[in-house]
Interface confidence: medium
C-alpha cells in the first residue's frame, strides 16, 4: 500500500522538531519542495529544510555516541574496577611481603635491625614502582639488598669488633660481596623469581590499563559525515514526510551500522587476540610466576642466604680480612 | 629454618581461617576476571547489531522504513535497505579506521605481542635456570602449598597465599619500624575499587 | 619519517608479465588507501589504480582494467601491481602513492580525502 | 570520466615575479559538504611528485605561504606569489571526486 500523504500542515514535524530545537523558525509551515535537501532527498513536498537536516545529523550523532557508551558500559566497568583491584591487592601483597621479612630479620636476627628495616623497606619500595612501570632493573634492586645487607651482616654479626662506621670497608664489602659470592646462588635464585614474577604483573596491570584505554577510545569516538549522513537518513528522514512512528527496517539499520562502524570492528580481531593473549598469561601466574607467593616467600629465602654466609662464616672473615685488610687498617690507626 | 613471623598477626583468627576450602585469592580473582572478559570477546564484531538491537527497529510493524519510503518488512525493496543511489557506500569502504582507532590497533598489537612474550609455556612449572640452582619441582606437593625457597632444611611453605578479602589487608606491628620507609597510602584495612585506574578522561 | 620503495621494474616482451612491489614505513599502512600512478617518457601523470585499506576494494583506469592487478599483504607492509599482457604502452615511471589524511572540520566530524600525500621515487 | 584542462601548458617566468596557472574540470569538484575536491602537485626535475595544495585552497605541510590555491565548482587557480629558481618543474591539477582520478596534462 502506498503511504500516507504528509502532513498537510507539517504540524506533526513541527511539534517533534521542537523537542530537538527550541523555536520553529527552521520549520516549514506547509510541504515545501525542499530542492535544498542533501541528506533527506524528498520524492514529493517536504516538512525538512536544510537547517533542520543539520539539526537532525547532529542529533543522530549523539545518538550514535550514547548508544556506544552505552554498549560498553559493563565492559568499561569490569576492567576499570578490575585494574583498580589488582592495583591495590599488589600494593599490599608488597605491604606484607615487606612485613614478613622484617619480622624475619627482627625474630632472627634483631642485631641487623633497625639497618635490615631500611634496606628492605628501600627493596620493596622499589619493587612497587616497577610493578607500576617505573624503568628499574629487577637484577640492580635485588643486588642493591644483597649489598647493602653484607656490610651489616659482617660488621654486626660476623666481626663485631670492629668501628660502628667504617665507610671504606663497606665499599670493600659491597665488592667483595659479589666477587666471593658471599650469599652463594640466593641472590641469583631471588633475582630469577623476582624478575619474572613482576615482570608477569607488570605487563597484567599495563594490559589492564590499555583495556580501559581501548574502551575509551571507543567510548569517545567521532563518526564520519558518510555516516551522520546515514544515520540521518535511517533515523529522521521519514519525518519530512510526516511518518513519525515508523521505525526503520532490521536489514537496513545493519547495513548502516557496519557502514558506520567499519573502522571500529577493525578492533575486533586484536581484541581477540588480547583477551585470549591474557587469558595464557594468567594460566601461567603460578609458581615462579606468581608475584604474591614469590615476594611472600622472601623472607625464608633471605633467611636462608644469611644463614648460608653464617655456615661459611669462619673461611669468609679470613678471606675478607685479607681483601679489605687495607681499608680496615686505615680505619683502625 | 626461618622464625615464620606468626606471632606478628594483630588478629591471630585470621590464621585459623586461612585454610577455608574456597577462598577468594588473588589467582582466582584473576581467573574469573579472565572468564567474564571471555563474555565479551566478541564485543566490537557484535557491536553494530547491538545498536541496533537497542535504538528503534521495526520488529512486529508490517512496514518499516529503508531510508527513502515505507515499505513492507519482508519485501524486496526493504532487503535492499534504500541505499540505492543515495552516496557511494563504497566511500566507507575504501576508508581504514579513523586515526584514534588505528592508533590503539597498534597499542593493541604491542600488548599482545609482549602477552605472548610473556606467557609462561604451558607445562613448564619451573625454569630451567631454577633447577639448575638446586630447586627441584619435586619439592613441593599440592596445589593448597607453595614452597619458595631453597638449601635443604631452610625450605619454607607459606600456606595458600593471601585471602583476597578484606581479611586481606592485616596488618604487622613492624610496618612503623625505625628506618622502614612508609610509601603510599599504608592505612588499607580493606580492598577498594571506587577509583579509576588508567587514562580516564 | 613516511617511505615508500618501488621495486620490481623491469624490460619485458610484449604480452608478458611483471609484478612491482612498494615497500612502506613510517605509518600505519593498514589504515590506508593506496594508489599506483605511471607517467610515461616526457609525458605526464597518469593515475592507474587504488586499492582500500583492508584489500577488499580495488578500482582501475580503462587502460589498465582486466590486465592489472592492485593488492596489498597488511602483515609485509607491502603494496603490489601484477602486470599481465603488456603492451608498448605500459612502459612509464610506476609510482606508488599514499593516500592523503584524515582532516576534522568544524562541526566535529572526521572525514577522509583521497589525494595522494606521499610518493615514492618510482620504478622503471 | 572527468577531464582536467590546464593552462597554459609552459610558462616561462623571472625570479620575484608572480606566476598564476589556470585548470578547468569537466564537471563540478564541489561535494555536498562544500568541498572542491582538487589538488595540485609539482614534479620538480628527476624527482618524484609532491603535494602542494589540497580540497582546492589547503597547503599540505611544508608548503611555502608563497603557494596558493582558489576557485569553486570546475574553474581552479594555482598562483605563486614570488616565484623562485627552486620553483622549476611540471605542475598538474588532479581530482580526486570519484574515479578514475584524472590529472591535468601538466603546466611546465
Known amino acids: 500500500q502506498p503511504p500516507p500523504p504528509p502532513d498537510a500542515t507539517c504540524h506533526q514535524v513541527r511539534s517533534f522538531f521542537q523537542r530537538l530545537q527550541p523555536g520553529l523558525k527552521w520549520v516549514p509551515e506547509t510541504p515545501v519542495p525542499g530542492s535544498d535537501l542533501q541528506v533527506c532527498l524528498p520524492k514529493g513536498p517536504t516538512c525538512c529544510s536544510r537547517k533542520m537536516e543539520e539539526k537532525y545529523q547532529l542529533t543522530a550523532r549523539l545518538n550514535m555516541e550514547q548508544l556506544l557508551q552505552s554498549a560498553s558500559m559493563e565492559l568499561k566497568f569490569l576492567i576499570i574496577q578490575n585494574a583498580a583491584v589488582f592495583q591495590e591487592a599488589f600494593e599490599i601483597v608488597v605491604r606484607h611481603a615487606k612485613n614478613y621479612t622484617n619480622a624475619m630479620f627482627k625474630n632472627n636476627y634483631p642485631s641487623l635491625t633497625p639497618q635490615a628495616f631500611e634496606f628492605v623497606g628501600e627493596f620493596f619500595t622499589d619493587v612497587s614502582l616497577y610493578i607500576l612501570g617505573s624503568d628499574i632493573n629487577v637484577d640492580d634492586m635485588v643486588n642493591e639488598l644483597f649489598d647493602s645487607l653484607f656490610p651489616v651482616i659482617y660488621t654486626q654479626m660476623m666481626n663485631p669488633g670492629l668501628p660502628e662506621s667504617v665507610l671504606d670497608i663497606n665499599e670493600c664489602l659491597r665488592g667483595a660481596r659479589r666477587d666471593l659470592k658471599v650469599f652463594g646462588s640466593f641472590p641469583k635464585l631471588i633475582m630469577t623469581q623476582v624478575s619474572k614474577s613482576l615482570q608477569v604483573t607488570r605487563i597484567f596491570l599495563q594490559a589492564l590499563n590499555l583495556g580501559i584505554e581501548v574502551i575509551n577510545t571507543t567510548d569517545h569516538l567521532k563518526f564520519s559525515k558518510d555516516c551522520g549522513r546515514m544515520l540521518t537518513r535511517m533515523w529522521y528522514c521519514s519525518y519530512c514526510q510526516g511518518l513519525m512512528m515508523v521505525k526503520p527496517c532490521g536489514g537496513y539499520c545493519n547495513v548502516v551500522m557496519q557502514g558506520c562502524m567499519a573502522g571500529v570492528v577493525e578492533i575486533d580481531k586484536y581484541w581477540r587476540e588480547y583477551i585470549l593473549s591474557l587469558e595464557e598469561l594468567v594460566n601461567g601466574m603460578y609458581r615462579i610466576y606468581d608475584m604474591e607467593n614469590v615476594l611472600l616467600g622472601l623472607f625464608s629465602t633471605i633467611h636462608d642466604s644469611i644463614q648460608y654466609v653464617q655456615k661459611n662464616g669462619g673461611k669468609l672473615t679470613t678471606t675478607i680480612g685479607k681483601l679489605c685488610a687495607h681499608s680496615q687498617q686505615r680505619q683502625y690507626r | 629454618s626461618a622464625y615464620y613471623p606468626e606471632d606478628l598477626f594483630i588478629d591471630k583468627k585470621i590464621l585459623k581461617v586461612a585454610h577455608v576450602e574456597h577462598e577468594e585469592t588473588l589467582s582466582s580473582r584473576r581467573r574469573e576476571l579472565i572468564q567474564k572478559l571471555k563474555s565479551f570477546i566478541n564485543f566490537y564484531s557484535a557491536l553494530p547489531g547491538y545498536i541496533c538491537s537497542h535504538s528503534p527497529v521495526a520488529e512486529n510493524d508490517t512496514l518499516c522504513w529503508n531510508g527513502q519510503e515505507l515499505v513492507e518488512r519482508y519485501s524486496q525493496k526493504a532487503a535492499r535497505n534504500g541505499m540505492k543511489n543515495q552516496f557511494n557506500l563504497h566511500e566507507l569502504k575504501m576508508k581504514g579506521p579513523e586515526p584514534v582507532v588505528s592508533q590503539i590497533i597498534d597499542k593493541l598489537k604491542h600488548i599482545n605481542q609482549l602477552l605472548r612474550t610473556m606467557s609462561v609455556p604451558k607445562g613448564k612449572v619451573l625454569d630451567k635456570s631454577l633447577d639448575e640452582e638446586g630447586l627441584e619441582s619435586g619439592d613441593c606437593g599440592d596445589d593448597e602449598d607453595e614452597c619458595i625457597g631453597s638449601s635443604g632444611d631452610g625450605m619454607v611453605k607459606v600456606k595458600n597465599q593471601l585471602r583476597f578479602l578484606a581479611e586481606l589487608a592485616y596488618d604487622l606491628d613492624v610496618d612503623d619500624a625505625p628506618g622502614n620507609k612508609q610509601h603510599g597510602n599504608q592505612k588499607d584495612n580493606e580492598i577498594t575499587t571506587s577509583h579509576s585506574v588508567g587514562n580516564m578522561p | 619519517q613516511v617511505q615508500l620503495q618501488e621495486s620490481g621494474g623491469g624490460v619485458v616482451q610484449p604480452g608478458r608479465s611483471l609484478r612491482l612491489s612498494c615497500a612502506a614505513s613510517g605509518f600505519t599502512f593498514s589504515s590506508y588507501a593506496m594508489h599506483w600512478v605511471r607517467q610515461a617518457p616526457g609525458k605526464g601523470l597518469e593515475w592507474v589504480a587504488v586499492i582500500s585499506y583492508d584489500g577488499s576494494n580495488k578500482y582501475y583506469a580503462d587502460s589498465v582494467k582486466g590486465r592489472f592487478t592492485i593488492s596489498r599483504d597488511n602483515s609485509k607492509n607491502t603494496l603490489y601491481l601484477q602486470m599481465n599482457s603488456l603492451r608498448a604502452e605500459d612502459t612509464a615511471v610506476y609510482y606508488c602513492?599514499?593516500?592523503?589524511?584524515?582532516?576534522?572540520?568544524?562541526?566535529?566530524?572526521?572525514?577522509?580525502?583521497?589525494?595522494?600525500?606521499?610518493w615514492g621515487q618510482g620504478t622503471t | 570520466d572527468v577531464v582536467m584542462t590546464q593552462s597554459p601548458l609552459s610558462l616561462p617566468v623571472t625570479p620575484g615575479e608572480p606566476a598564476s596557472i589556470s585548470c578547468r574540470s569537466s564537471?563540478?569538484?564541489?561535494?555536498?559538504?562544500?568541498?572542491?575536491?582538487l589538488d595540485w602537485y609539482v614534479q620538480k626535475p628527476g624527482q618524484s611528485p609532491q603535494r602542494l595544495i589540497y580540497l582546492g585552497s589547503i597547503r599540505a605541510s611544508g608548503v611555502p605561504d608563497r603557494f596558493s590555491g582558489s576557485g569553486s565548482g570546475t574553474d581552479f587557480t594555482l598562483k605563486i606569489s614570488r616565484v623562485e629558481a627552486d620553483d622549476v618543474g611540471v605542475y598538474y591539477c588532479m581530482q580526486a571526486l570519484q574515479t578514475p582520478w584524472t590529472f591535468g596534462q601538466g603546466t611546465k
Open positions: 602513492a599514499k593516500e592523503g589524511t584524515y582532516y576534522y572540520d568544524s562541526s566535529g566530524y572526521w572525514d577522509y580525502y583521497y589525494g595522494m600525500d606521499v
Open positions: 564537471q563540478s569538484l564541489l561535494d555536498s559538504d562544500g568541498y572542491n575536491f
